[in-house]
Interface confidence: low
């Protein structure tokens, strides 16, 4: 027993004064704690602890399970211990079959002996199987057998503690080692969708998938810039021994506009952390926004093709789309398709293909789209550029020469006089009157221009040219004059 100098508190003394005691099963255990300040006896073996406030610990008929460490403590908190082995030929080992080992750490197979005098205290594989070659262990009769540096490959290893008693090998109950893997990488996290768009009152539900080697990975949903605890539900699976998957589902049963924001799924283990985010946008009602991909005023030459193209955002999904011209709906010549195949897509494209446009096909082309909440439209003003066409060229009774031309853009009419029989006219003649005849008519289609000159100004034989032109092209008509004496005679005009 320990000795200390007088004046200092000393640990209690135990009788018998031994560090170890061996008792046969059925015999008495009698331990006396000698200390004026005795407080209690404590018995410990494996996970079990018992206490006794009597200074004499008596067990009348000792059982194997009374094997363990008996500690006497005094009021100063000082203690002394004796280890008692209760030798029971029928029960050589005390066992706690729960056996967990952390990868790369040591773990204790808890099978303390009830008889310290046996030999070959060691581990054996079940059913005669050998232990892994690299498995190292250290036996301790009072605690069990420590497996050094547990490997992941030892998971589900079946073991017995073994000892030789009176020449026979005795095995304990079997142990199954469960290895808790060490984290050697950060968790793998993914989210069901990167963004969500909802209307007020709709349910928001998003699932984060966390994958790691074991279930002790920590995970949580967080709202960025907020400390509010979010409601989550979990499902989990073990796909094999070291392949764990958890699904953490975050739900807001009736989303509001102020729920909009970024939500982060965060996971960490002892190696490190990982996160993934999803964005929620909640709108008070649905919407449609249309973006023309070409100018809404379109000029196209006669006989050419043009494509009217819009992109539009629609939420919820568009239900009805149509292209209209002159109160008529196109049944073909157009297509409508999503901009992306992503299920979060809200952007769409619509194209109207106009081919070999005629001058009469100018006008307003309208795209209409609607969903369950709103409808929207956009109009394209299509102008067909046409080369001027001379509709009439006449000598009026009042002696005026009149030329009427139609085209788009608005044609300009110039007059020329050619002396003699020359077809190449250079001398220009100023018109007496110019009018745009349909300026107040429909805004699309050809514009009609009328121009007149006074023929009395011409004193010689010759040709008068009426030339109508615009950006697209030009057209001419001719008047021939011949004088017989004093009479002026108009020859029929020609183009």
């Amino acid at each position: 027993q320990p000795s200390v100098s007088p004046g200092e508190p000393s640990p209690p003394s135990i009788h018998p004064a031994k560090s170890e005691l061996i008792v046969r099963v059925g015999n008495e255990i009698r331990l006396l704690c000698i200390d004026p300040g005795f407080v209690k006896w404590t018995f410990e073996i494996l996970d079990e602890t018992n206490e006794n406030k009597q200074n004499e610990w008596i067990t009348e008929k000792a059982e194997a399970t009374n094997t363990g460490k008996y500690t006497c403590t005094n009021k100063h908190g000082l203690s002394s211990s004796i280890y008692v082995f209760v030798r029971d030929p029928a029960k050589l080992f005390l066992v706690d079959r729960s056996l967990y080992g952390k990868e790369d750490n040591d773990t204790l197979v808890r099978c303390p002996l009830t008889d310290p005098e046996v030999t070959s205290y060691s581990l054996k594989g079940c059913q005669g199987k050998p232990l892994p070659k690299d498995l190292r262990f250290v036996p301790d009769p009072k605690a069990g057998i420590t497996i050094k540096s547990v490997k992941r490959a030892y998971h589900r290893l079946c073991l017995h503690c073994s000892a030789d008693q009176e020449g026979k090998s005795v095995l304990s109950d079997k142990f199954i080692l469960k290895v808790r893997p060490a984290f050697k990488a950060v968790p793998v996290v993914s989210v069901s969708k990167a963004s969500y768009l909802l209307r007020e009152g709709e349910e928001f539900t998003v699932t984060c998938t966390i994958k790691d080697v074991s279930s002790s990975v920590y995970s949580t949903w967080k709202r960025e810039n907020s400390q509010t605890k979010l409601q989550e539900k979990y499902n989990s699976w073990h796909h094999g021994d070291f392949n764990y998957e958890r699904q953490a589902t975050l739900t807001i049963s009736s989303a509001r506009v102020n729920d909009s924001g970024v939500f982060m799924c965060y996971a960490n283990n002892t190696f490190g952390s990982a996160n993934v985010t999803t964005t929620l946008e909640v709108v008070d009602k649905g919407f449609i926004n249309i973006f023309p991909m070409i100018n809404t005023t379109v000029f196209v030459n006669d006989g050419e093709n043009v494509d009217l193209i819009v992109e539009y955002e629609a939420f919820p999904k568009p239900e009805h789309q149509q292209w209209i011209y002159m109160n008529r709906t196109f049944t073909d010549k157009w297509e409508d398709y999503p901009k992306s195949e992503n299920e979060s897509n809200i952007r769409y494209v619509s194209e109207l293909h106009l081919t070999r446009l005629k001058g009469t096909e100018g006008g307003t082309y309208t795209f209409l789209v609607s969903n369950s909440d709103v409808n929207a439209s956009i109009a394209f003003n299509v102008y067909v550029n046409t080369k001027p066409e001379i509709l009439t060229y006449d000598r009026l009774v009042n002696g005026m020469l009149q030329c009427v031309a139609a085209g788009f853009p608005e044609p300009t009419i110039d007059w020329y006089f050619c002396p003699g029989t020359e077809q190449r006219c250079s001398a220009s003649v100023l018109p007496v009157d110019v009018q745009t005849l349909n300026a107040s008519g429909p805004p699309f289609g050809k514009l009609v221009v009328q121009s007149s000159i006074d023929s009395s100004a011409f004193k010689h034989n010759g040709t008068v040219e009426c030339k109508a032109y615009n950006d697209v092209g030009k057209t001419s008509a001719y008047f021939n004059f011949a004088f017989k004496g004093n009479n002026k005679e108009q020859i029929h005009p020609h183009t």
């Epitope: 996970d47 079990e48 018992n50 399970t65 005390l94 066992v95 706690d96 729960s98 079997k174």
Partner: antibody, heavy 122, light 106 residues
């Protein structure tokens, strides 16, 4: 599916014998302690006997010691209870139960059979 | 031998009620106590082991507490399927059961 199915019950006269069997499936039978628990008509549960997984250790309720023998055949995944010198008070439903440890020599019964009825009457 | 005494032997309760059943051991059994549920004509079913550990698949409305000699099983909100007889069992030295508590519909 983890399952225990008892058989062998019946009507027997006082002093007679019966042998109950329990067929285990769906788990590693040879790695578990097994027990018999009984329930007299209208009464509570009473532990009767148990056996360790190799079959080398057995324990009995005092009132059945010397009359009942528990045994097992790990190759056949079967548990047995040989009941001799039967008495009227042995009348009960007999359940086969799988025992498991938590901590040191601490038991609970986590899987039970549906029971077999033993009636001892003249 | 260790004797186990349960109380009450029977009780009447309604769906949604909080129900408490107690079990007393004749000597200390540390935390070595289990609870079972049994319905008429059926085998017992393990609910709780080692005083408070919920067996896999058992609803969280069941909970256990206590240590030494006094133990409690609590059903936080009684459901229709919970009407049954409940037994405690000690696993400290050999194995013995309490007399049972029958939970009936009020």
């Amino acid at each position: 599916e983890v399952q225990l199915v008892e058989s062998g019950g019946g009507l027997v006269q006082p002093g007679g014998s019966l042998r109950l069997s329990c067929a285990a499936s769906g788990f590693a039978f040879s790695g578990y302690y097994m027990a018999w628990v009984r329930q007299a008509p209208g009464k509570g549960l009473e532990w009767v006997a148990n056996i360790n997984y190799p079959g080398s250790s057995t324990y009995y309720l005092d009132s059945v010691k010397g009359r009942f023998t528990i045994s097992r055949d790990n190759a056949k995944n079967s548990l047995y209870l040989q009941m001799n010198s039967l008495r009227a008070e042995d009348t009960a439903v007999y359940y086969c139960a799988r025992g498991d440890y938590y901590g040191t020599t601490y038991w609970y019964f986590d899987v039970w059979g549906q029971g077999t009825t033993v009636t001892v009457s003249s | 031998d260790i004797q186990m005494t349960q109380s009450p032997s029977s009780l009447s309760a309604s769906v949604g009620d909080r129900v408490t059943i107690t079990c007393r051991a004749s000597q200390s059994i540390s935390s070595y106590l289990n609870w079972y549920q049994q319905k008429p004509g059926k085998a017992p079913k393990l609910l709780i082991y080692y005083t408070s550990r919920l067996q896999s698949g058992v609803p969280s409305r069941f909970s256990g507490s206590g240590s030494g000699t006094d133990f409690t099983l609590t059903i936080s909100s009684l459901q229709p399927e919970d009407f049954a007889t409940y037994y405690c069992q000690q696993g400290r030295r050999l194995w013995s059961f309490g007399g049972g508590t029958k939970v009936e519909i009020k």
